[in-house]
Every structure is written in C-alpha cells, then in structure tokens.
C-alpha cells in the first residue's frame, strides 16, 4: 500500500505526524496563540515533547536565524510556576536553560543562546517570533 504523507498548510513543515509553522512576525504570547488558532485544525503554539522533536525544530529555525527567541506553547497561567502546554499535552519533557525563571515571566520561549534547544521564561507581552503546531 502507498501511504501518503499528510500535507501541511503552505509554508509549514511536516515532522512525525505534526505540522509546524515558524512565524517570523512579532506578536506577544497571547496574540501569537490566536494567530496559530486561526489556521484551524487544532493549531496552537507548539508543544515540544521530546529531544528529537526539539532538535528537528531547532535545526529548521537555525536555517533562518540564530539570534531571535521564539514563543512556544508553554505557559504559567496561574503565575505559580505551574507550567502547562496550551494544547493540553502532558508536561513531561523539560528543557529549561536553568536561568530566568520567576519574576513576571510566565511564558516560555526557545532561547537562541543554545541554538533553540533550551527554553527560557519571558514576559508574555514581549513581541517575538513564534512557532505553531497541529496534527493534520
């Protein structure tokens, strides 16, 4: 049997049953999430659930730029350091850079300091690039 790989929205890339869209426009975290949702298909700011997934994403983004942090779908909505993925995925894999937790930083970004493989928390109203994800 021929198994067709599902198609992603124009400009998005496919990896392991998911479509990813790297948005090089600048939005705060909540606006970025709304832009992701506008694509339908259950799209949200991206959850990153394994080192393999993180590495694939990091390699893709590094082909475009290496200095701008990127919003992902991890946030701390209760402001109690109880982080959760906006798409409802289980918060098991963690890749914090170890610094910049706490303060008024309740949204997570992929940090450019370690080639986008680690995360930092940041103020949610900062305008940054962002990464969306959905399962086609």
């Amino acid at each position: 049997d021929i198994i067709m790989r599902p198609s992603c929205a124009p400009g998005w890339f496919y990896h392991k049953s998911n479509c990813y869209g790297y948005f090089r426009k600048l939005r705060n975290w909540s606006d970025a999430e709304l832009e992701c949702q506008s694509y339908g298909n259950g799209a949200h700011l991206a959850s990153i659930l394994s080192l393999k997934e993180a590495s694939t994403i990091a390699e893709y983004i590094s082909g475009y730029q290496r200095s701008q942090p990127i919003w992902i779908g991890l946030h701390d909505p209760q402001k109690r350091q109880q982080w959760q993925w906006i798409d409802g995925a289980m918060y098991l894999y963690r890749s914090w850079s170890g610094k910049s937790m706490g303060g008024n930083k309740h949204c997570a970004e992929m940090s450019s300091n370690n080639n986008f493989l680690t995360w930092s928390s940041n103020e949610c109203n900062k305008r940054q690039h962002f990464l969306c994800k959905y399962r086609p």
Partner: antibody, heavy 119, light 112 residues
Framework: EVQLLESGGDLVQPGGSLRLSCAAS????????MSWVRQAPGKGLEWVSA????????YYADSVKGRFTISRDNSKNTLYLQMNSLRAEDTAVYYC????????????WGRGTLVTVSS | QSVLTQPPSVSGAPGQRVTISCTGS?????????VHWYQHHPGTAPRLLIY???NRPSGVPDRFSGSKSGTSASLTITGLQAEDEADYYC????????????FGGGTKLTVL
C-alpha cells in the same frame, strides 16, 4: 486575485475627523493582519497602524496614537481607519495593505486615498 | 528621520546594474529581522519586490535581487530598464521602537 480598494479620503479642516475604508476581495480576509501606510507629499512611506486578523489586537505608530483607531468588519471584508483630531501633517495618501500570514512583508496594496488637512 | 537609511537617489543607464543600500543597526537589520523591498511608481499601488531578504514573489523578474549582511541590506537591479524608474523602499522591524514595522526613507531611481 487580491484586490484592495481604499475610499473616504477628503479635504478636512485641522481638528476634524474622517473615516477611511478599505474593501478587500479575492482572499479570506479574516485570516490576514492588515495595515495602513501613508505617504505625505514629497515624503516616503510611513507605517500608521495595523490590526490582527480577528481584530483583537491593534498597533499604532507613535505619531497617531490616541487620535486614530483601526478596526475591521470581517463579515463585510472591510478595514477602517477612524482619524480624529487631524493635523496638517496627517496630509497624505493612505494605503491599506495586507500582511503575509507568516512573515512581516506587506504583500498586497491598494492604490490609496488622499487625505488633505487644511483650513 | 528613518532608522533605516537609504540613499535619496541613484541613477543608471539602460542595461546597467545599480545597487540601493539600506543601512540599519543592531536593533533592526542586525538583530536578524527580515528585510523586504518595495517598488513604488507614484500614483500606483506599491509592489512587493523582495521578501525575507532575498526572495522574489512570483511575477518579479530575476533582474531584481536582494541581500543582507550584518546591519545592512541591499537591492540590486541588473539590466536596468526604463520601467524600473521608481521609488524603492526597504522595510524591517526595530526592537527599540514601539511600532510595528519601519520603512527606509526611500530611494528615487532614475534611468538615464
């Protein structure tokens, strides 16, 4: 084919108000952020304001903040710019432009509408 | 005064090659923000010419090319034609400003 058609430009006195409209067709309007960009006589392009596809987020240049309001009616495929407390320096051709969905470029533009602020 | 600096004017004879520069800083072009270029014939709608530093939208001739290095970007037009006479603008984003996008001051290209 993407089409953007601005209207509403006029001669208005300083301190007056005006509402510009931009009728969009040829694409799914609600999926795109939109901007207003202006060009004063003899000057370059100046970004004025932008609005997200849903209309939930708006952005303004410092020069118009508090005086101009951007809005959209996705059911009518129309973008608006409400201009209050107009000044002589607001005299310009005003263009509406569509922003690419994933990047910051303005990929489609209208031909513009002229706003003249003079007594 | 724009945060992106372009020469006010450039000129060239038909068939020649011209380059328009767009100089920024570490808070815009140098911060890995994309640069886009527009062509504007007065009285018409501006036209996207180059996006994401180097890419041409469909319908734009390959005589137009873009590049970016450090805190500067440039637009190069080869095989200059009479219809290329227009105003050209670079556009990026500046992290030090509260705005959304920022344009260069524009460059008037004259075909001699």
């Amino acid at each position: 084919e993407v089409q953007l058609l601005e209207s509403g430009g006029d001669l208005v006195q300083p301190g007056g108000s005006l509402r510009l409209s931009c009728a969009a067709s040829g694409f799914t309007f609600s999926s795109y952020a939109m901007s207003w960009v202006r060009q004063a006589p003899g000057k370059g392009l100046e970004w004025v304001s932008a609005i997200s596809g849903s209309g939930g987020s708006t952005y303004y240049a410092d020069s118009v903040k508090g005086r101009f309001t951007i809005s959209r009616d996705n059911s009518k495929n129309t973008l608006y710019l409400q201009m209050n407390s107009l000044r002589a320096e607001d005299t310009a051709v005003y263009y509406c432009a569509r922003e690419d969905r994933m990047r910051t470029q303005l990929d489609s533009w209208g031909r513009g509408t002229l706003v003249t602020v003079s007594s | 005064q724009s945060v992106l600096t372009q020469p006010p004017s450039v000129s060239g004879a038909p068939g020649q090659r011209v380059t328009i520069s767009c100089t920024g800083s570490s808070s815009n072009i140098g911060a890995d923000y994309d640069v886009h270029w527009y062509q504007h014939h007065p009285g018409t709608a501006p036209r996207l010419l180059i996006y994401d530093n180097t890419n041409r939208p469909s319908g734009v001739p390959d005589r137009f090319s873009g590049s970016k290095s450090g805190t500067s970007a440039s637009l190069t037009i080869t095989g200059l034609q009479a219809e290329d006479e227009a105003d050209y603008y670079c556009q990026s984003y500046d992290a030090s400003l509260s705005g959304y996008v920022v344009f260069g001051g524009g460059t008037k290209l004259t075909v001699l």
